[in-house]
């Protein structure tokens, strides 16, 4: 994995220390011909975490174009959620316009859906 | 070493709640997520769900949400695992589980409750 | 939900033989597959984790190999404490599924 990022099952990571919106974030990681993390299985889920910390951190899911979906394509109805209770939720009401269409960490590692532009962590991820 | 020990057996009316404990020992308890598991008499075994003893967090099987409500006591090392609504077909043995590499790696030695009118 | 199947239900064989249990998930989970030995009246214990690792306590003679879809557990030379029920589990995604057990039995 190129310096500053961490390997884990084929894939090597990056945890940004900083925050910026969802698109901001994905642009970012694009930059580093990588994408926000996608994340596929329980054990991915924890390997996350762990590094993460309990920080609201973005991850590649969106339904801002309708269903929710992947960055990088992978089915979202067939594979791993680990949304927290209730959620998503497409909230409404926080009276700043639209519902809720990024998803993230929260500080416990369960999913939640929030407004884009809000400026959390993120976590980029690529092949090795 | 490692030790997962539940509380006794149970035997509970249709309709009424139960609340099985799960004590951990030997190891840092809000490190380790904590799986339910349950097996019906002659049957597999059935995933119910876990809690995150650090933050307290809860992810159920769909099957049970509603009924189901995982909690803990840090200063005991303490899990638990409530069940409302019983029915017969709740009648099992309940295990908690800790939460290894891609398995459950320790378990507890199991809790009967029996649903009976 | 991910099903897990496992084949065959039952095997009787002899102390010494070599027994082969496979296990199949209906969709990838890439290597996340446990495998457990049940006894009457016990907890499962865990024998395999990550499909090919073996938990530490457990005899040599365990092994397991797998991924995507197709998982296997090979006991190489059966020994009269292996009698008991073998359960596969995936471990990629919630629910997470057993499957439905495979009884060793002596022949």
């Known amino acids: 994995c190129p310096v500053n990022w961490v390997g884990y099952e084929g894939s090597c990571y990056w945890f940004s220390r900083s925050g910026k919106p969802w698109p901001e974030a994905e642009k970012y990681c694009q930059l580093e011909n990588a994408h926000l993390v996608v994340v596929g299985s329980w054990e991915e889920q924890k390997f996350i975490q762990h590094h993460v910390g309990p920080v609201n951190s973005w991850i590649g899911l969106t339904d801002q174009s309708g269903p929710w979906k992947w960055v990088d394509g992978t089915d979202y109805e067939s594979g791993f959620k680990n949304w927290r209770p209730e959620q998503p939720d497409d909230w409404y009401g926080h009276g700043l316009g639209g519902g809720e269409d990024c998803a993230h960490f929260t500080e416990d590692g369960g999913w939640n859906d929030d407004i884009c532009q809000r400026p959390y962590r993120w976590v980029c991820e690529t092949q090795r | 070493q490692v030790q997962l020990v539940q509380s006794g057996a149970e035997v509970k009316k249709p309709g009424a709640s139960v609340k099985v404990s799960c004590k951990a020992s030997g190891y840092t308890f809000t490190d380790y997520y904590l799986h339910w598991v349950r097996q019906a008499p002659g049957q597999g075994l059935e995933w119910m769900g876990w809690?995150?003893?650090?933050?307290?967090?809860?992810n159920y099987a769909q099957k049970f949400q509603g009924r189901v409500t995982m909690t803990r006591d840090t200063s005991i090392s303490t899990a638990y695992m409530g069940l409302s609504s019983l029915r017969s077909d709740d009648t099992a043995v309940y295990y908690c589980a800790r939460d290894g590499t891609s398995s459950f790696d320790y378990w507890g030695q199991g809790t009967l409750v029996t649903v009976s009118s | 939900d991910i099903q897990m199947t496992q084949s065959p239900s039952s095997v009787s064989a002899s102390v010494g033989d070599r027994v082969t249990i496979t296990c199949r998930a209906s969709?990838?989970?890439?290597?996340?597959l446990a495998w457990y030995q049940q006894k009457p009246g016990k907890a499962p214990k865990l024998l395999i984790y990550g499909a090919s690792s073996l938990q530490s306590g457990v005899p040599s003679r365990f092994s397991g190999s797998g991924s995507g879809t197709d998982f296997t557990l090979t006991i190489s030379s059966l020994q009269p404490e292996d009698f008991a029920i073998y359960y596969c589990?995936?471990?990629?995604?919630?629910?997470?599924?057993f499957g439905p057990g495979t009884k060793v039995d002596i022949k």
């Open positions: 589990q995936q471990a990629n995604s919630f629910p997470f599924t």
């Open positions: 969709q990838g989970i890439s290597r996340w």
């Open positions: 809690i995150h003893p650090n933050s307290g967090g809860t």
